[in-house]
């Protein structure tokens, strides 16, 4: 048979951050190539990454069309140089991926503190609105554009001179916190989607501290 040296893909895994979405699988091919297909539950199959020797396929362009849909992918294995060959049942070997719903499952990318400004005993901390790969009307939408009120941020802040952390939450991209006069503070933020059951939190942003370039200090 044409498939004697062909093995089915396995360990199909979705890797997705801010909707940049790649399907990965094993094994590294030996005398075989792969083609990937993707579909929504109710839709037709669309082929991607034709006859590739890679073990990953970027499916971002397909899933960003409707991030709230649930997707299924499958990876077909073909003998190298003989891609018309089929298995004993008359079709090439393939393996299905787990289902994937981008809106519920894409990882939240590491956020960035855009700026902070102190006015007296208050500090305003602003979180950068990360760009996603979801595109509408030739414009890339931001994380807030996609998730709206589902997205909140948690701020961790502490005096530079101590290790005791305080937290604040916002469902916008800004925090206004009270600080002690004359003290320098450090800040880190985390994106959170509380309604999720998986991948609820991003990694923490890089730490930014007062007295460094990014912030602005105004004594009033």
């Amino acid at each position: 048979s044409g498939t004697t040296n062909t093995v089915a893909a396995y360990n199909l895994t979705w890797k997705s951050t801010n909707f940049k979405t790649i399907l990965e699988w094993e094994p590294k091919p030996v005398n075989q190539v792969y083609t990937v297909q993707i579909s929504t539950k109710s839709g037709d199959w669309k082929s991607k990454c034709f006859y590739t020797t890679d073990t990953e396929c970027d499916l971002t362009d397909e899933i960003v069309k409707d991030v709230k849909q649930t997707y299924l992918a499958r990876v077909f294995s073909y003998p190298a140089g003989n891609v018309e060959s089929t298995g004993s049942a008359g079709e090439p070997l393939y393996e299905n991926s787990p289902e994937f719903t981008p809106y519920l499952e894409t990882n939240l990318g590491q956020p960035t503190i855009q700026s902070f400004e102190q006015v007296g005993t208050k500090v305003n901390v602003t979180v950068e609105d990360e760009r996603t790969l979801v595109r509408r009307n030739n414009t890339f939408l931001s994380l807030r554009d996609v998730f709206g009120k589902d997205l909140i941020y948690t701020l961790y802040y502490w005096k530079s001179s101590s290790s005791g952390k305080k937290t604040a939450k916002t469902n916008t991209n800004e925090f206004l916190i009270d600080v002690d006069k004359g003290e320098n503070y450090c800040f880190s933020v985390q994106a959170v989607i509380p309604s999720r059951t998986v991948n609820r939190k991003s990694t923490d942003s890089p730490v930014e501290c007062m007295g460094q370039e990014k912030g602005e200090f105004r004594e009033i």
């Epitope: 554009d145 998730f147 916008t172």
Partner: nanobody, 129 residues
């Protein structure tokens, strides 16, 4: 959820102008994108315009682009629709909606995390010829 109240509708002659307002009460107005939709008698509700949470991005239906302008004032929790060069076919009840920008642009496709957002009660715009 935010509560929305539209105002500014009325009767105007073709070629005239109106400015609609949508005042929001409730928490975190600036977490929401805002959209204007309209529904003419016997027709389905249709998208008119949307603005992102920060006001940095605006989107328009082809039928109103160049004539209507959407804007927002996050300090006043209000979104506006400036309507110029009005036509009889602009006659409809105009509604504002608070949701994610994605949901406003895509409409109600359903699926996880989707709801209909927050809607106001609407304001009537009538354009006479």
């Amino acid at each position: 959820e935010v509560q929305l109240v539209e105002s500014g509708g009325g009767l105007v002659q073709a070629g005239g102008s109106l400015r609609l307002s949508c005042a929001a009460s409730g928490r975190a107005f600036s977490a929401y994108a805002m959209g204007w939709f309209r529904q003419a008698p016997g027709k389905e509700r249709e998208f008119v315009a949307a603005i992102s949470w920060s006001g940095g991005s605006t989107y328009y239906a082809d039928s109103v682009r160049g004539r209507f302008t959407i804007s927002r004032d996050n300090t006043k929790n209000t979104v506006y629709l400036q309507m110029n060069s009005l036509k009889p076919e602009d006659t409809a009840v105009y509604y504002c909606n608070a949701d994610s920008l994605l949901s406003l642009l895509d409409g109600s496709r359903g699926g996880p995390g989707t709801d209909s957002g927050s809607w106001g009660q609407g304001t009537q715009v009538t354009v006479s010829s």
